[in-house]
C-alpha cells in the first residue's frame, strides 16, 4: 500500500453523562487510515496535569491501513479547559501534523445550517461591478463559531469583523459578508463559507452558474465579399460566434468542406464586448475557383455552454442573376455647410444580394470607413437594392470634382464591376458612364430644356443638360427631377446628380 496520512477525530463523552462531582475524566483522539506505522500523538493539557496512554495500532481489515487511539485522563478544573491532541505522521512528511482542539465533553447542540446568498444582477441581467456573497449561519445552539471564506479551497484574507450574531429564542444566527470584484466572480472560481463549531466543520459553496440556457448564443457564417472574390482574388469566409458568456471553457471552431477536401489555415480572434459577452471570429481563406464552382464550407462550433454543437454552412448563392444598375447623385449645397457635400449612390435590381460598394477619388479607392452603405434590401420586384452615402470636403472636390461609386457584383460584365461618376458641381464637370447600358424607363425627356430644374436653387443647368421625370419605380418622390448629359460618341446619357 502507498503512504497515507491519518484522519484525526476527537473522542469525548456527552456532558450530561459525566457526574458533576467527577474528579477526573478521560478523553481520546483517534488517528485512523494511515500507512505505514507509526504515528506520534502528544497532548497539550494547558495548566492541568494528565496522564496519557496510546493503544497499540490495529490493522483495518479491508485497506491494510492502521488505526490507533490515544487516551488522556485529567483531573482538577477540567470543565472549562480546552485540550489539544497533536498527531504527527512522519512517513507522510517530516512536518505532517494535525491538531484537534476540544473540550472534555460534548453538549447536546443543534448544528448550524450554512447557506450562501448572492447579490442580484442588474435590471439588464448583467453582473454589477461588485458581487456580495452573504453567508448565513443559522439555527445553532449559542456557542463559539469560527467563519472562514475560501476561494477554490484556499483561505481568503477577509475582514470578518463585519460578521454579526443574533439570538432568537434558544438558537443563534450569524452572518458574514464577502465582497468580490466582477472579475473574480466571472473567473469561475468556487467560493466557500466554512464554519467551525463544536469541533465540527459545516460549509456551503457557490460559483457563477453556467447559463443553463445560452443567452441566445448565435453563430453566423459569411460569404466572401465580391470585392475579395473578384478584385483582390483572395476570398475569405468568416465564422462569427456572438453572445458567449466568458468562462474557462474555450470556444472550439472547426472548419470543413462538404467535398471532404482539406481546408486552409484559419485565423481566430476573440473580443470581449461592452456587455461582458465574448465574440469569437474565425476567418478562413478559400480558393476562388472552389467557391465559384460551388464548394460548400462548414464551420462547427462547440462550447461548454452550448447544448449542442452548432453547424453553419455557406456556399455560392443559387438562383437567377441580374447585374446592378448604379445611379450616383450629389446633394445641393445646404446653408451652413458650404465646405461639405454628401454624395449618394443607389444600386438596384441586382441578384443575388452579395455586393461590394466602393467610392473612388482620383482613381484611388477611399477607405470603407469614409462611406456608409445600407444592407441589401429587397425591391418590390425580385432584386435587391442598397444606398451608399459619402461625405466629401471642398478641398477634395476642388482638387478634382469627380467621384466614382463602384459596385462589385458577380453578374456585372465584363469585369464584375459597374461604376458611375458624380460631380459636386455637375455644370462644371461631367461624369462618364462605364460598363452601364442605359436602363429602360430611366427618363422621359424631349431633348429640350424643360425650364428651371427644381432642386438647383435657381441655377441654370449646363447647356447640354436636360431635365426629366425620374423612374416610375424610384424609391422616392415621383416628381424628383434628374439630369441627363447628352454626350457625343460614348454613352448617350449619364447621371450627373440632382438637377
Amino acid at each position: 500500500a502507498s503512504t497515507q496520512s491519518p484522519s484525526v477525530f476527537p473522542l469525548t463523552r456527552c456532558c450530561k453523562n459525566i457526574p458533576s462531582n467527577a474528579t477526573s475524566v478521560t478523553l481520546g483522539c483517534l488517528a485512523t487510515g494511515y500507512f505505514p506505522e507509526p504515528v506520534m500523538v502528544t497532548w497539550d493539557t494547558g495548566s492541568l496535569n494528565g496522564t496519557t496512554m496510546t493503544l497499540p495500532a490495529t490493522t483495518l481489515t479491508l485497506s491494510g491501513h492502521y488505526a490507533t487511539i490515544s487516551l488522556l485522563t485529567v483531573s482538577g478544573a477540567w470543565a472549562k479547559q480546552m485540550f489539544t491532541c497533536r498527531v504527527a505522521h512522519t512517513p507522510s512528511s517530516t512536518d505532517w501534523v494535525d491538531n484537534k482542539t476540544f473540550s472534555v465533553c460534548s453538549r447536546d447542540f443543534t448544528p448550524p445550517t450554512v447557506k450562501i446568498l448572492q447579490s442580484s444582477c442588474d435590471g439588464g441581467g448583467h453582473f454589477p461591478p461588485t458581487i456580495q456573497l452573504l453567508c448565513l449561519v443559522s439555527g445553532y445552539t449559542p456557542g463559539t463559531i469560527n467563519i472562514t471564506w475560501l476561494e477554490d479551497g484556499q483561505v481568503m484574507d477577509v475582514d470578518l469583523s463585519t460578521a454579526s450574531t443574533t439570538q432568537e429564542g434558544e438558537l443563534a444566527s450569524t452572518q458574514s459578508e464577502l465582497t468580490l470584484s466582477q472579475k473574480h466572480w466571472l473567473s469561475d472560481r468556487t467560493y466557500t463559507c466554512q464554519v467551525t463549531y463544536q469541533g465540527h466543520t459545516f460549509e456551503d459553496s457557490t460559483k457563477k452558474c453556467a447559463d443553463s440556457n445560452p443567452r441566445g448564443v448565435s453563430a453566423y457564417l459569411s460569404r466572401p465579399s465580391p470585392f475579395d472574390l473578384f478584385i483582390r482574388k483572395s476570398p475569405t469566409i468568416t465564422c462569427l460566434v456572438v453572445d458567449l458568456a466568458p468562462s474557462k471553457g474555450t470556444v472550439n471552431l472547426t472548419w470543413s468542406r462538404a467535398s471532404g477536401k482539406p481546408v486552409n489555415h484559419s485565423t481566430r480572434k476573440e473580443e470581449k464586448q461592452r456587455n461582458g459577452t465574448l465574440t469569437v471570429t474565425s476567418t478562413l481563406p478559400v480558393g476562388t475557383r472552389d467557391w465559384i464552382e460551388g464548394e460548400t464550407y462548414q464551420c462547427r462550433v462547440t462550447h461548454p455552454h452550448l447544448p449542442r454543437a452548432l453547424m453553419r454552412s455557406t456556399t455560392k448563392t443559387s438562383g437567377p442573376r441580374a447585374a446592378p444598375e448604379v445611379y450616383a447623385f450629389a446633394t445641393p449645397e445646404w446653408p451652413g455647410s458650404r465646405d461639405k457635400r454628401t454624395l449618394a449612390c443607389l444600386i438596384q435590381n441586382f441578384m443575388p444580394e452579395d455586393i461590394s460598394v466602393q467610392w473612388l477619388h482620383n482613381e484611388v479607392q477611399l477607405p470603407d470607413a469614409r462611406h456608409s452603405t445600407t444592407q441589401p434590401r429587397k425591391t418590390k420586384g425580385s432584386g435587391f437594392f442598397v444606398f451608399s452615402r459619402l461625405e466629401v470636403t471642398r478641398a477634395e472636390w476642388e482638387q478634382k470634382d469627380e467621384f466614382i461609386c463602384r459596385a462589385v457584383h458577380e453578374a456585372a460584365s465584363p469585369s464584375q464591376t459597374v461604376q458611375r461618376a458624380v460631380s459636386v458641381n455637375p455644370g462644371l464637370a461631367g461624369g462618364s458612364a462605364q460598363s452601364q447600358r442605359a436602363p429602360d424607363r430611366v427618363l422621359c425627356h424631349s431633348g429640350q430644356q424643360q425650364g428651371l430644374p427644381r432642386a438647383a436653387g435657381g441655377s441654370v443647368p449646363h447647356p447640354r443638360c436636360h431635365c426629366g421625370a425620374g423612374r416610375a419605380d424610384w424609391p422616392g418622390p415621383p416628381e424628383l427631377d434628374v439630369c441627363v448629359e447628352e454626350a457625343e460618341g460614348e454613352a448617350p446619357w449619364t447621371w450627373t446628380g440632382l438637377c
Epitope: 448564443v217 471553457g249 462547427r300 462550433v301 462547440t302 447544448p307 449542442r308 453547424m311 453553419r312
Partner: antibody, heavy 119, light 110 residues
Framework: QVQLVESGGGLVQPGGSLRLSCAAS????????MTWVRQAPGKGLEYVSI???????WYANWASGRFTISRDNSKNTVYLQIDSLRAEDTATYYC?????????????WGQGTLVTVSS | DIQMTQSPSSVSASVKDRVTITCQAS??????LAWYQQKPGQPPKLLIY???TLASGVPSRFSGSGSGTEYALTISSLQPEDFATYYC????????????FGGGTKVEIK
C-alpha cells in the same frame, strides 16, 4: 454500426423513481451530444433533455427538477434519472444521438424503453 | 422559446400524389431545421437536416425548403412506404421550450 439500446423502463408506482440507461456502441460516444426524447402512447415526440460533449445538460421547461441526465463515456452509457414519477410520464423514452457536426438534428435513435406509471 | 407549429395535422393522399407539409417557427431559425419520418412501433428516422439537406439513404423524392420562420417538407411522388407520421424539429439549440418538435403530420392513404 451505430446502436443505441435503452433499458430500465417498466411499471412503476406514482411517486417512484426510475433510472433509464442507454448503451451506445459502434461510435465514439464522447464525440456526440446526446438527447432523450419521449413519446406518450398515440402522441407526438417530446424533447426531454440534452447533454453535450462537455457533460453540461439542459432540460425542457417541464422536465426541470425531476429529470437528471448524465453520461459515462468510459462505460459508453447515457442515463436519465426520473424522480417523483407521475401518470403523465407514461411514455416510450428514446435515447438519441445528435449529428456530430451539430445543429442538424438526430441521426440515430434507440428502439425506446416503455415507462408505465400506474398504481 | 421557439415553438414549432406543424400543419396539417393529417393529410389523405394517394400513391404518386405530391404532398407538402409545413412547419412554422415562432421566431426565425438561422440554421438547423430537421424533418423525421416515423412509422408505428418504430423510432423516428432523420430525413432532412439543415432545412434542405437529404440525410444519407433518403430517396430524392423527399425535399426540404424554407427559411426564417416558414419551412416545408415535400414528397414529390408519394410511395406506399411513405405513409407515416412526419415531424419537424428545430435543431439549432435545445431551447428551454416545451418542445422543439412540431406536433406531427400523419400521411394516410386516401
Amino acid at each position: 454500426q451505430v446502436q443505441l439500446v435503452e433499458s430500465g423502463g417498466g411499471l412503476v408506482q406514482p411517486g417512484g423513481s426510475l433510472r433509464l440507461s442507454c448503451a451506445a456502441s459502434g461510435f465514439t460516444l464522447s464525440n456526440h451530444d446526446m438527447t432523450w426524447v419521449r413519446q406518450a402512447p398515440g402522441k407526438g415526440l417530446e424533447y426531454v433533455s440534452i447533454i453535450n460533449t462537455y457533460g453540461n445538460h439542459w432540460y425542457a421547461n417541464w422536465a426541470s427538477g425531476r429529470f437528471t441526465i448524465s453520461r459515462d463515456n468510459s462505460k459508453n452509457t447515457v442515463y436519465l434519472q426520473i424522480d417523483s414519477l407521475r401518470a403523465e410520464d407514461t411514455a416510450t423514452y428514446y435515447c438519441a444521438r445528435e449529428t456530430h457536426h451539430g445543429s442538424s438534428g438526430i441521426d440515430h435513435w434507440g428502439q425506446g424503453t416503455l415507462v408505465t406509471v400506474s398504481s | 422559446d421557439i415553438q414549432m407549429t406543424q400543419s396539417p395535422s393529417s393529410v389523405s393522399a394517394s400513391v404518386k400524389d405530391r404532398v407538402t407539409i409545413t412547419c412554422q417557427a415562432s421566431e426565425s431559425i438561422y440554421s438547423g431545421l430537421a424533418w423525421y419520418q416515423q412509422k408505428p412501433g418504430q423510432p423516428p428516422k432523420l430525413l432532412i437536416y439543415d432545412h434542405s439537406t437529404l440525410a444519407s439513404g433518403v430517396p430524392s423524392r423527399f425535399s426540404g425548403s424554407g427559411s426564417g420562420t416558414e419551412y416545408a417538407l415535400t414528397i414529390s411522388s408519394l410511395q406506399p412506404e411513405d405513409f407515416a407520421t412526419y415531424y419537424c424539429q428545430h435543431a439549432d439549440y435545445a431551447h428551454h421550450s416545451d418542445n422543439v418538435f412540431g406536433g406531427g403530420t400523419k400521411v394516410e392513404i386516401k
